[in-house]
């Protein structure tokens, strides 16, 4: 399977809320023995790997963020300590994989990655991640709302989290 | 915070039978593989085998095939193991330990405080 | 069964001293686990994936290698740090546990 992020760039206002999607493509096991483990990290472009450095989200570590379910069903965190951070990372029956950032501020801005593991019974085999920018930005020169910027040209589109 | 909590030591009678408990708090008891593992002295650790309490499915080690057998209870979040026709090999602490799945690795990541099954005439 | 041997079976080290300790696998794996055990107590997981610390174990710890053979390495030794450490593998059945590696500190 592999990884795809829809959007590579979204730039948003402060105080509002984003949604970060991946999305996981391409023939994914749905074997009884079969699990994903996904989450949701900060990083920075290394010059050799990005995604390779891990820092938390609000506090946040990838353990903090992260869901473990069967190939075949949908996941969501419900647990308060998310929450509490106005965060909250999602995956539907449709290979979408999100995180929902709530109440935005400028020390929201940075690189987001999302990593995708698929686990055969307790063996982990293929680990794949996805990287997206997030600009948040105040003052006259801020959009109204979250615009993202498509990973293959750049024609942007409104989108803002509920 | 994930504690899993086995049941008491206990002392018994060649050929007799044991079941210690293993209760699980703090996590989706269900969803997560719970592993027997046997320490004898000077004997380091040895992996009888699993249960995935969900399901009720079982991995056991050949070597403990007829000698343990897993039954799990999630209304009580409780997995148990039973050891049969017990001789002074099965004298050893027994550990129940929970599958953690951390950072997409899962591996051995809660242990109950141990078991200590002792078999003497 | 994968056998997993560990070496030295003892390790005798003085407080700042660099010591490593090996395990060995009868085929080859794609990681490694490690975990400690102090006397008395249940094991803890220390190294995940060959070289990942657990939360909470001290960045002296280290642990690397690949295929057959993998090792867990500590900088500057610690008292606290005397405990036996051993390597598991879960790829196949019967998952195993290396002999172990009791650490004594001098």
């Known amino acids: 399977f592999k990884v795809a992020t829809l959007y590579s760039l979204y730039v948003c206002p402060e105080g509002q809320n984003v949604t970060l999607t991946c999305r996981v493509f391409g023939p994914v096991d749905k074997g009884h023995d079969v699990t994903f483990y996904k989450t949701w990290y900060r990083s920075s472009r290394g010059e050799v790997q990005t995604c390779s450095e891990r820092r938390p989200i609000r506090n946040l570590t990838f353990q903090d963020l992260h869901l473990h379910h069967g190939g075949h069903q949908a996941a969501n965190t419900s647990h308060d300590l998310a929450q509490r951070h106005g965060l909250e990372s999602a995956s539907d029956h449709h290979g979408n994989f999100s995180i929902t950032m709530r109440n935005l501020t400028l020390l929201d801005s940075g690189l987001y990655c999302c990593l995708v593991v698929e686990i055969r019974h307790h063996h982990s085999e293929h680990r794949v991640h996805g990287a997206m920018e997030l600009q948040v930005q105040t003052g006259k020169d801020a959009p109204s709302s979250c615009v993202a910027y498509p990973s293959s040209s750049q024609e942007s589109e409104n989108i803002t989290a509920a | 915070q994930v504690q899993l909590q086995q049941s008491g030591a206990e002392l018994m009678k060649p050929g007799a039978s044991v079941k210690i408990s293993c209760k699980a708090t703090?996590?989706?008891?269900?969803?997560?593989?719970i592993e027997w593992v046997k320490q004898r002295p000077g004997h380091g650790l040895e992996w009888i085998g699993e249960?995935?309490?969900?399901?009720?499915?079982?991995n056991y080690n050949e070597k403990f095939k007829g000698k343990a057998t897993f039954t799990a209870d999630t209304s009580s979040n409780t997995a148990y193991m039973q050891l049969s026709s017990l001789t002074s090999e099965d004298s050893a602490v027994y550990y129940c330990?929970?599958?953690?799945?951390?950072?997409?690795?899962?591996?051995?990541?809660?242990w109950g405080q141990g078991t200590l099954v002792t078999v003497s005439a | 069964q994968i056998v997993l041997s560990q070496s030295p079976a003892i390790l005798s080290a003085s407080p700042g001293e660099k010591v490593t300790m090996t395990c060995r696998a009868s085929?080859?794996?794609?990681?490694m686990h490690w975990y400690q055990q102090k006397p008395g107590s249940s094991p803890k997981p220390w190294i995940y994936?060959?070289?990942n610390l657990a939360s909470g174990v001290p960045a002296r710890f280290s642990g690397s290698g690949s295929g057959t053979s993998y090792s867990l390495t500590i900088s500057r030794v610690e008292a606290e740090d005397a405990a036996t450490y051993y390597c598991?593998?879960?790829?196949?059945?019967?998952?195993?546990f290396g002999g172990g590696t009791k650490l004594e500190i001098k």
């Open positions: 330990a929970g599958e953690e799945v951390y950072d997409g690795y899962p591996w051995f990541g809660y």
């Open positions: 703090g996590y989706t008891f269900s969803r997560y593989w």
């Open positions: 249960i995935l309490p969900g399901s009720g499915s079982t």
């Open positions: 085929s080859s794996l794609s990681y």
């Open positions: 994936a060959t070289s």
């Open positions: 598991q593998q879960w790829s196949s059945n019967p998952y195993t």
